[in-house]
Interface confidence: low
């Protein structure tokens, strides 16, 4: 029943071109190239893509033509290695070109940069964008794919095609509207926010595959799909997991044409077999392809079958537990995870994986004991503290969020995480803590039954951002330890960190706390980031500062900005009042 078993093709590039069509082929090759060579100008990438496309067309016409039998990695790698400025732009990445496949592709993958040194994307005036859209729609949309792909080198390529389709629809509709800005800007904001979330979610999938292996990803997928499709049989879930793993392995490995093609096949399979998968798929399956795949990926959990029997019978009380486990360990553990997950849509995936790991550890120990049954009889009791820990944490943090509101909740997390890992760069601490703080507005509004899967699985995504950014320039052994020891225990590991007593406070630098009139023209969000950056720096200077001390300084800072932004001579106000503020802050914190 494998969706992806295909006949051998003489020419892989011709096969993918025919399967995907020229438009999608070109878009996916552009994404692939931009994700590898993140610094190359747009025009250079377009030229490379056009050359590859023309070559693919010759292979479609004659699959036996010269070089058409080469693998996609060989063809694309050869093309990337023709870039004249590779050495001066990318340094040691150019050494990849001396290698043979598959080592060359692995080398390119290792040089993907999660935090490339690229300018922030500034949104032009609406009229300027609409003119550019009307002048050359195709170039305008390619530019969107290019700019997103180079900044997000692990963005899920077939999903980026869906974003581009929505981007195009927004401009098509709004550039004809009476009030273009009122129509367009909210849509672009929504796409930007959804895009960042999508990128971060996919980054976790790729990290899971690349750092912890296929088994870790498959376990995650079994748990998530079992929650989503609780009526599906274990064999059906296993088949979907196998296919989904192939899709994500391909995309994370830079095989974007194969990934998009296989994702399409998987969507088709799911829709043709809805009856044995989920009752919630009907609407998704009536949509066009890109929308269909997105919809399936986001579909709500189906209702749990009525009268599911107790898990204890098969996994604790049965005398055959050790026999079944020994015969096929991963299948038996997969069944345990499936059965537990389909009964617990109220648990986070990472919690379900912790329970499965505890169960596995217990069986490993007990099945070698004199009386196995006696040994594992109480295994379910070991689950209780594992379940209660995230429940309590979420309850406490949601109470704090409701009390403080999002901005001040983010500030509380900024202080908490800066004290835990003060060596981490300030921009990373600000970005990660702001995102951690968004868990409040995202998840605390949900009823109890939906809070944990929302909160803890979201936190896994955000902490992975910290892990990948830290991996680029490691500065903290504690971060490395929490990031690498266990994928499912990352959040508990960070939660358990106390103040780093070994940290030597940063030297005080008045320049860090010098502000200018330009802060007055910033958006509210940008102004918040400025203030939160100052807060992190304060904690790095004075890690033992109390909440009260920090609050007093931040209140003074807010009043200072407000006062000077209302002043006639703003720059003078910032210079003079700024000096006073620095002196007062130093006194308040005993610096």
């Amino acid at each position: 029943r494998g969706v992806f078993r295909r006949d051998a093709h003489k020419s892989e590039v011709a096969h993918r071109f025919k399967d995907l069509g020229e438009e999608n082929f070109k878009a996916l090759v552009l994404i692939a190239f931009a994700q590898y060579l993140q610094q190359c100008p747009f025009e250079d990438h377009v030229k490379l893509v056009n050359e590859v496309t023309e070559f693919a067309k010759t292979c479609v016409a004659d699959e036996s033509a010269e070089n058409c039998d080469k693998s996609l990695h060989t063809l694309f790698g050869d093309k990337l290695c023709t870039v004249a400025t590779l050495r001066e732009t990318y340094g040691e990445m150019a050494d990849c070109c001396a290698k043979q496949e598959p080592e060359r592709n692995e080398c390119f993958l290792q040089h993907k940069d999660d935090n490339p040194n690229l300018p922030r994307l500034v949104r032009p005036e609406v009229d300027v964008m609409c003119t550019a859209f009307h002048d050359n729609e195709e170039t305008f949309l390619k530019k969107y794919l290019y700019e997103i792909a180079r900044r997000h080198p692990y963005f899920y390529a077939p999903e980026l095609l869906f974003f581009a389709k929505r981007y195009k629809a927004a401009f098509t509709e709004c550039c004809q509207a009476a009030d273009k800005a009122a129509c367009l800007l909210p849509k672009l904001d929504e796409l930007r926010d959804e895009g960042k979330a999508s990128s971060a979610k996919q980054r976790l999938k790729c990290a899971s595959l690349q750092k912890f292996g296929e088994r870790a990803f498959k376990a995650w997928a079994v748990a998530r799909l079992s929650q989503r499709f609780p009526k599906a049989e274990f064999a059906e879930v296993s088949k979907l997991v196998t296919d989904l793993t192939k899709v994500h392995t391909e995309c994370c490995h830079g095989d974007l044409l194969e990934c998009a093609d296989d994702r399409a096949d998987l969507a088709k399979y799911i829709c043709e077999n809805q009856d044995s998968i989920s009752s919630k798929l009907k609407e998704c399956c009536e949509k066009p392809l890109l929308e269909k795949s997105h919809c399936i990926a986001e579909v709500e959990n189906d209702e749990m079958p009525a009268d599911l029997p107790s898990l204890a019978a098969d996994f604790v009380e049965s005398k055959d537990v050790c026999k079944n486990y020994a015969e096929a360990k991963d299948v038996f553990l997969g069944m345990f995870l499936y059965e537990y997950a389909r009964r617990h849509p109220d648990y986070s995936v990472v919690l379900l994986l912790r329970l499965a790991k505890t169960y596995e550890t217990t069986l490993e120990k007990c099945c070698a004991a004199a009386d196995p049954h006696e040994c594992y009889a109480k295994v379910f009791d070991e689950f209780k503290p594992l379940v209660e820990e995230p429940q309590n944490l979420i309850k406490q943090n949601c109470e704090l969020f409701e009390q403080l509101g999002e901005y001040k909740f983010q500030n509380a997390l900024l202080v908490r995480y800066t004290k835990k890992v003060p060596q981490v760069s300030t921009p990373t601490l600000v970005e990660v803590s702001r995102n951690l703080g968004k868990v409040g507005s995202k998840c605390c509004k949900h009823p109890e039954a939906k809070r944990m899967p929302c909160a803890e699985d979201y936190l896994s995504v955000v902490l992975n951002q910290l892990c990948v950014l830290h991996e680029k320039t490691p500065v903290s052994d504690r971060v490395t330890k929490c990031c690498t020891e266990s994928l499912v225990n990352r959040r508990p590991c960070f939660s358990a960190l106390e103040v780093d007593e070994t940290y030597v406070p940063k030297e005080f630098n008045a320049e860090t706390f010098t502000f200018h009139a330009d802060i007055c023209t910033l958006s509210e969000k940008e102004r918040q980031i400025k203030k939160q950056t100052a807060l992190v720096e304060l904690v790095k200077h004075k890690p033992k500062a109390t909440k009260e001390q920090l609050k007093a300084v931040m209140d003074d800072f807010a009043a200072f900005v407000e006062k000077c932004c209302k002043a006639d001579d703003k720059e003078t106000c910032f210079a003079e009042e700024g000096k006073k503020l620095v002196a007062a802050s130093q006194a308040a914190l005993g610096l």
Epitope: K18, D19, G21, D261, L290
Partner: nanobody, 115 residues
């Protein structure tokens, strides 16, 4: 965009045959997959047959051996030859096409199998 227009539907007796056609126009160079779906009153849309640009086909068990999908690329037309028709084959039949998924749809043609 791609426009699809079905024809050939009608009333036929059980055991009889019918041939549906679907004419495609517009940006047809991007079309790789073409398919037939059907929807009976009160039922969800059901997949009937698919053909790729290269000519490979697939069918669900319910129609395998009775229905044959084919395409004439020179005429930009898709066909569905339906033999041994049954009452349960009564439905509106839709032609669908697309580069990766079937994202363009026709308006449908009604097939009624009744004595």
């Amino acid at each position: 965009q791609v426009q699809l227009v079905e024809s050939g539907g009608g009333l036929v007796q059980p055991g009889g045959s019918l041939r549906l056609s679907c004419a495609a126009s517009g940006s047809i160079e991007s079309i790789n997959r073409m398919a037939w779906y059907r929807q009976a009153p009160g039922q969800q849309r059901e997949f009937v047959a698919r053909i790729s640009k290269g000519g490979s086909t697939n069918y669900p068990d319910s129609v395998k051996g009775r229905f044959t999908i084919s395409r004439d690329n020179s005429k930009n037309t898709l066909y569905l030859q339906m033999n041994s028709l049954r009452a349960e084959d009564t439905a509106v039949y839709y032609c669908a096409a697309g580069p990766v998924w079937e994202q363009f749809w026709g308006q449908g043609t009604l097939v009624t199998v009744s004595s």
